[in-house]
């Protein structure tokens, strides 16, 4: 008797976060020789009998969590793990900003700070070349997120997005990049020397942050909170 | 996969250009699939007007968007594109292409057919 | 809307050489890039899709490289039927814009 079935994968190319009108595909991998895949969006009737979901143009309506399944035989296997289709662009761009300043010394502290003007509850912090956001509720219109003991890994490109926690796979568009430079010297600069050129954003390379909150009235808990479950 | 565009040759300026591309080899209900237009002036680079896909989404080109108008007889395997309105500067030859999500290209040509707007 | 843009407008160069046509995009497109090659009175045929991908039938010759907002398309050993116009395109949201094109001669 054969093993129970493995649950296959389900990815977003190039990335689960779409701005609205980009492409984006949906491919749900399992075991060679699957006789059936099932793609479905959560929370709708929505699904369909194959492994490939292309969006020519993202809308807004597409948002929301997928899911996918295959079938050999008569058994179906497990679902795998729920992916976040997230539309960007949906509203207009945070603010990033560091505080003291985007120069910080090896083993110094630092904060960026995502504001928007509108009332959105809700805030993920990037650094190019991570796989996930940091996320952070909190209120008044802007978030927090300390970095403590601050390492030369911490060095990179930021972006912010906002968004509501009613609505949470409709957000922003991206911050301005914030450029992040870690200085060996004893003695960080203030200069504020923020990029505003508009850098690849990739997710190929997996680096961690460490971020905890700071600010009074963010919640208890860490404030990273891997945004793919 | 063949694609043959066919068009009125010669139009005056003010008219409406009604182009057909006809294609065998593929059929415009298979999930993924769509159909294009592009046209290149003599001499000129290649320029997108528009495109259709299987499921009836329609994208045109922002400059010329109000001029076009793109649709397809799927059970006929045809697609059709309108220019109202042209001018010498529409004088070209227009192409139709197949489209293919995976890889998002252009993985098919027509010969083209071209068009000459003069009074 | 997404510029591309290709460079050189125009190469000359012998059988044999190899060349590398480039293309820039104004903003990150992942992938969503091919190139075509054009000969004097036809229609276009595509040469790479998804950047990288050499389509059906084209010879080995040529490959394409890059992601983000750099592409290139290398032919090595350039043959007699090579020559001709190139054009990249992306595919990136609409509108899908092609690069200016890059005439290449027999020196």
């Known amino acids: 008797q054969r093993g129970p079935l493995p649950k296959p994968s389900l990815q977003a190319l190039p990335s689960s976060l779409v701005p609205l009108e980009k492409p984006v595909t949906l491919r749900c991998q399992g075991p060679p020789g699957v006789d059936l895949y099932r793609l479905e969006k959560l929370s709708s009737s929505r699904y369909q009998d194959q492994a490939v979901l292309f969006i020519p143009a993202m809308k807004r309506h597409l948002a929301g969590r997928y899911r996918c399944s295959y079938q050999n035989g008569s058994l179906w296997s497990p679902p795998s793990d729920q992916l976040e289709l997230v539309a960007t662009g949906v509203f207009a761009k945070p603010s990033l900003s560091a505080q003291p300043g985007p120069a910080v010394s090896s083993g110094g502290d630092v904060t960026l700070q995502c504001q928007t003007r509108y009332g959105f509850d809700q805030f993920a912090l990037y650094k190019e070349g991570d796989p996930a956001p940091y996320k952070n509720p909190e209120r008044w219109y802007r978030a927090s997120f300390p970095i403590i003991t601050v390492t030369a890994a911490h060095s990179g490109t930021y972006r912010c997005y906002s968004f509501s926690s009613g609505d949470p796979y409709l957000w922003s568009a991206p911050s301005d990049p914030l450029e992040l430079m870690v200085t060996e010297f004893s003695e960080a600069t203030t200069e504020l020397t923020v990029s505003l050129t508009n850098k690849v954003f990739t997710t190929e390379t997996s680096r961690s942050i460490t971020a905890s909150p700071k600010e009074p009235g963010s919640p208890a808990g860490p404030a990273r909170q891997h945004y793919t479950k | 996969v063949t694609l043959k565009e066919s068009g009125p040759g010669i139009l005056q300026p003010s008219q409406t250009l009604s182009l057909t591309c006809s294609f065998s080899?593929?059929?415009?209900?298979?999930?993924?699939?769509?159909v294009g237009w592009i046209r290149q002036p003599s001499g000129k680079g290649l320029e997108w007007l528009a495109h259709i896909w299987w499921d009836d989404n329609k994208y045109y080109n922002t400059a010329l968007k109000s001029r076009l108008t793109i649709s397809k007889d799927t059970s006929n395997n045809q697609v059709f594109l309108k220019i109202a309105s042209v001018d010498t500067a529409d004088t070209a030859t227009y192409y139709c292409a197949r489209i293919h999500y995976y890889g998002s290209s252009l993985d098919y040509w027509g010969q083209g057919t071209t068009l000459t707007v003069s009074s | 809307d997404i510029q591309m843009t290709q460079s050189p407008a125009s190469l000359s160069a012998s059988v044999g050489e190899t060349v590398t046509i480039t293309c820039r995009a104004s903003?990150?497109?992942?992938?969503?890039l091919a190139w075509y090659q054009q000969k004097q009175g036809k229609s276009p045929h595509l040469l790479v899709y998804a950047a990288t991908n050499l389509a059906d039938g084209v010879p080995s010759r040529f490959s394409g490289s890059g992601s983000g907002t750099q592409f290139s398309l290398k032919i090595n050993s350039l043959q007699p039927e090579d020559f001709g116009s190139y054009y990249c395109?992306?595919?990136?949201?609409?509108?899908?814009?092609f690069g200016g094109g890059t005439k290449l001669e027999i020196k």
């Open positions: 395109q992306h595919f990136y949201g609409t509108p899908w814009t």
């Open positions: 903003e990150n497109i992942y992938s969503y």
């Open positions: 080899g593929f059929s415009l209900s298979t999930y993924g699939i769509g």
